[in-house]
Amino acid sequence: DAEFRHDSGYEVHHQKLVFFAEDVGSNKGAIIGLMVGGVVIA
């Protein structure tokens, strides 16, 4: 059986980022995103 291994030679770090909804609209509360490799993806 073939074994597939991802080895790019570097780690991809991720970090949770929290923004206030008020800063981008009229809603209240927090917006949570995920930054992976320097890009916010969610």
């Epitope: 949770k16 980022l17 929290v18 923004f19 206030f20 008020e22 800063d23 209240k28 927090a30 995103g33």
Partner: nanobody
């Protein structure tokens, strides 16, 4: 940019309460989301809580949720952190910070103004 000055720290027994204050100078206080961070001996500065420019929205680190309450008074240019049910692991220097709108409020790099910190020690 605003200048910030914390107060209210001290020695408290486990299970006790403290209220931290942060006084801001400058007329632009309500342009900033405000946050509290803390730094325990030998550790990095970690996010505690933040409040939006209007004071309507708040966000807390999981470790303090349900025990700490952040609030602000824009008329007095003041930020507060009510800390209840304190634990020994809450021992740290507490810093208030100001972050521009639209920046992530849970990361240190978003904050461009800091106070000098106030020491909170939780010990019996």
């Amino acid at each position: 940019e605003v200048q910030l000055l914390e107060s209210g720290g001290g020695l408290v027994q486990p299970g006790g309460s403290l209220r931290l204050s942060c006084a801001a100078s400058g007329r632009t206080f309500n342009n900033y989301n405000m946050g509290w961070f803390r730094q325990a001996p030998g550790k990095g500065r970690e996010f505690v809580a933040a409040v939006s420019r209007s004071g309507v929205s708040t966000y807390y680190a999981d470790s303090v949720k349900g025990r700490f309450t952040i609030s602000r008074d824009n008329a007095k240019n003041a930020l507060y952190l009510q800390m209840n049910s304190l634990r020994p692991e809450d021992t740290a220097i507490y810093y208030c910070g100001a972050a521009y709108r639209g920046t992530a409020i849970n990361v240190r790099r978003s904050y461009d103004s800091w106070g000098q910190g106030t020491l909170v020690t939780v010990s019996s």
